[in-house]
Structures are given as structure tokens and as C-alpha cells.
């Protein structure tokens, strides 16, 4: 009696169970009563990453430098190429099909988390006692200068964008 289901890594065809092709290989011909499944390795720049019965291998992803992409990991016959972004850029999606420039944190904001190839810069407002006077993708908020430790007094209050201005003690009013 012909089988209705096959074991793992097999497929049912013409009422018989044939072996699937292993990762890195494509199907040339199905098995018969007398012959095994015939498989062939994927060509250069091609891959198949599962046990399969595909008759064509997939093309490796192309990391297009015009989109800011570069190869992070070269593909093999069993794996696709992994793209990442050039320095200073990050992927627009999980699939990393294109890149955008890292965001800079405006004055008054500091970098909470530096961008990576897959995530943008995370900025946060500088709290009272800290400031940032630059637009930067790397700089954290800086603490205000402590005038007291320099035996000076605050002449002008700091803001989230400016440091305090210290001055001599003798200007006390």
C-alpha cells in the first residue's frame, strides 16, 4: 500500500517517499522505485538554507553600496549574504535593504544610546545640572561646571544648552 506520509527530510511524490535535498543543494530529479533523489550543489552566489525540493537556488542578496550597504557576512551555499550599513548609517528595516544616516542629538539633548548598524541614535533631554551645546551622534550631556570647587560663584545660570558661567567671589552683592 502506498504511503500517505513520509519521514522527516523526505517528501511524497508519485505515491513514494523521496529524500529532500540537503541545504546548499537543489533538486535535479525526483527519486523513483530504482533511483535516489538527484541533487546538485548551488552555484556561485547562490544558496538554499533548508532541506528542500527546490529546482532553483536563491540568489545571494546584493549589498548595494549606492544604498549605503556593505557585506557584513559573505553568503555560502547554505546561507544568504548578510548586509549592514556603512559607518555612520543604520538599517531602515530588519531585512536591512537600505540605510539612513544616524540621527544627531540637538543642543539640549545628549546621546543616551549610540547608534549601531541596525539601530538609530537614541537621544534624551539634558536634565538640570547638565548641558549639551552641540549637535552630535556621540556626545552625552555634560555636567555644569562646579564653580564652588574652583572657589568661584555662579555668575550666570546654566541651561540645558549652556554651561554655567563662573566668576570671582568678590562680586557678591
Amino acid at each position: 500500500e502506498p504511503p500517505t506520509a513520509c519521514r522527516e527530510k523526505q517528501y511524497l511524490i508519485n505515491s513514494q517517499c523521496c529524500s529532500l535535498c540537503q541545504p546548499g543543494q537543489k533538486l535535479v530529479s525526483d527519486c523513483t522505485e530504482f533511483t535516489e533523489t538527484e541533487c546538485l550543489p548551488c552555484g556561485e552566489s547562490e544558496f538554499l538554507d533548508t532541506w528542500n525540493r527546490e529546482t532553483h537556488c536563491h540568489q545571494h542578496k546584493y549589498c548595494d553600496p549606492n544604498l549605503g550597504l556593505r557585506v557584513q557576512q559573505k553568503g555560502t551555499s547554505e546561507t544568504d549574504t548578510i548586509c549592514t550599513c556603512e559607518e555612520g548609517w543604520h538599517c531602515t528595516s530588519e531585512a536591512c535593504e537600505s540605510c539612513v544616516l544616524h540621527r544627531s542629538c540637538s543642543p539640549g539633548f545628549g546621546v543616551k544610546q549610540i547608534a549601531t548598524g541596525v539601530s538609530d541614535t537614541i537621544c534624551e533631554p539634558c536634565p538640570v545640572g547638565f548641558f549639551s551645546n552641540v549637535s552630535s551622534a556621540f556626545e552625552k550631556c555634560h555636567p555644569w561646571t562646579s564653580c564652588e570647587t574652583k572657589d568661584l560663584v555662579v555668575q550666570q545660570a546654566g541651561t540645558n544648552k549652556t554651561d554655567v558661567v563662573c566668576g570671582p567671589q568678590d562680586r557678591l552683592r
Epitope: 545628549g110 547638565f130 550631556c141 555636567p143 561646571t145 564652588e148 560663584v153 545660570a157 540645558n160
Partner: antibody
Framework: QVQLQQSGAELMKPGASVKISCKAT????????IEWVKQRPGHGLEWIGE????????NYNEKFRGKATFTADTSSNTAYMQLSSLTSEDSAVYYC???????????????WGQGTLVTVSA | DIVMSQSPSSLAVSVGEKVTMTCKSS????????????LAWYQQKPGQSPKLLIN???TRESGVPDRLTGSGSGTDFSLTISSVKAEDLAVYYC?????????FGGGTKLEIK
């Protein structure tokens, strides 16, 4: 110990100005920010601004800029807040408070005066 | 400006009960540079000035009983009184000191049944 003594209640006419005082004792007056806070029934607490007596440096809540003016006299350890062009909206209790202030941290209000009631009425 | 919202606006509890009041901010009060939450709690008893209870969201001022506990991080904070006493009758305010202008919540009035 730290104490802040405020001037007494004031009954003022609309359009007038009033100057409230806050005398500090028990610490080095010039080096800590003095905060000013407004409290109206049903309006909770509102921060007006702050002054550092040693230099006269100030920060104002934009809402009160032009309404409140802060000054300080280090010889008498007294901070002042002047409120101008008074209207009924300015009727409130006004508190001075000393912030707990260090340069790499934020500022909470550690010590409070007893409050000054300002009533604006024709 | 950072908006501070407190709830409930009032509540009545019996002596000995546990009570929790909340405070929410319109933006995070947690600064990653020092991992501190820029939030304070104050108690104002009838006819008195406000009194500082807690700073940095959870640090009790000296002399504040340990039945008062501040907790929370980011935008959500709470003040818990584990066993209410008659002397706790007051309005409780939260305040952010992350950025100018400093702002207060509208207060929670604690009444004793």
C-alpha cells in the same frame, strides 16, 4: 538649623506692586538657590523661579517673566520677590524655599518658609 | 513643560490601612547618565507649608518615617503609606526637577475616615 522667615500678609489694590521678603538663617545664604512658589486654592503649587543670592543669577518660569522679579541682599541674608501690575489672579500664598542644590544634580525644595498671603482686591 | 498628573485627587482611608497614590509625568524623569529619577514628594498638612518627604523618587529625607515609601521610574511613580496614622492627614504633591520650569502635580488629598 536652616530657617526661612517670610514677611507678613499683604492686602493690595489691582495694578499695584508688592515686594515679599524671605530672611534666611542657619546656612551660607549666598551659595544656595532660593526658589519661589505660588499656591492658589484649587491650583496646587506653581514654581515661579529661583535666584542664586551670591551672584544674582536667576531662572524664571516663562509664565511669570515680567510679573515676578527676584533680588537678594547678601548683607542681610534676605531674598525678595516683587510682583507687579497685580490682578485678582495674583491673590495667593507665596512661598520661598531653599533648594538642595549641587552642580551635577537636580534641585528639590528642601526647606520652606511659612508663606506670605497676598490678597488683591479693589 | 513637563506635565505632572496625580491620582486620585482625594481618598479617605481608615487608620492602619495601606494607601498608594500615583504620579505620572509627560516625559521620562530618568536620566541615563546617572540612572536617577528627578522626582520629589512633598507633604502639606492643613495650614502649613509643604515639607519635603522624598527625593530621587525613592530616597527618604531624614526624619521621614519608613512607613512612607517612594517608588517608580521613568514616567510612573507612587508614594505608599504602609499603615496610615491620623497625622498623615495632608495633601501630597509630586514635583519634577528634571527640567525648567520645575512642575508639580495637582496633589492627592488624604483624608482619614
Amino acid at each position: 538649623q536652616v530657617q526661612l522667615q517670610q514677611s507678613g500678609a499683604e492686602l493690595m489694590k489691582p495694578g499695584a506692586s508688592v515686594k515679599i521678603s524671605c530672611k534666611a538663617t542657619g546656612y551660607t545664604f549666598s551659595t544656595y538657590w532660593i526658589e519661589w512658589v505660588k499656591q492658589r486654592p484649587g491650583h496646587g503649587l506653581e514654581w515661579i523661579g529661583e535666584i542664586l543670592p551670591g551672584s544674582g543669577s536667576t531662572n524664571y518660569n516663562e509664565k511669570f517673566r515680567g510679573k515676578a522679579t527676584f533680588t537678594a541682599d547678601t548683607s542681610s541674608n534676605t531674598a525678595y520677590m516683587q510682583l507687579s501690575s497685580l490682578t485678582s489672579e495674583d491673590s495667593a500664598v507665596y512661598y520661598c524655599a531653599r533648594s538642595y542644590y549641587t552642580y551635577d544634580q537636580g534641585s528639590w525644595l528642601a526647606y520652606w518658609g511659612q508663606g506670605t498671603l497676598v490678597t488683591v482686591s479693589a | 513643560d513637563i506635565v505632572m498628573s496625580q491620582s486620585p485627587s482625594s481618598l479617605a482611608v481608615s487608620v492602619g490601612e495601606k494607601v498608594t497614590m500615583t504620579c505620572k509625568s509627560s516625559q521620562s524623569l530618568l536620566y541615563s547618565g546617572n540612572q536617577k529619577n528627578y522626582l520629589a514628594w512633598y507633604q502639606q498638612k492643613p495650614g502649613q507649608s509643604p515639607k519635603l518627604l522624598i527625593n530621587w523618587a525613592s530616597t527618604r529625607e531624614s526624619g521621614v518615617p519608613d512607613r512612607l515609601t517612594g517608588s517608580g521610574s521613568g514616567t510612573d511613580f507612587s508614594l505608599t503609606i504602609s499603615s496610615v496614622k491620623a497625622e498623615d492627614l495632608a495633601v501630597y504633591y509630586c514635583q519634577q526637577y528634571y527640567s525648567y520650569p520645575y512642575t508639580f502635580g495637582g496633589g492627592t488629598k488624604l483624608e482619614i475616615k
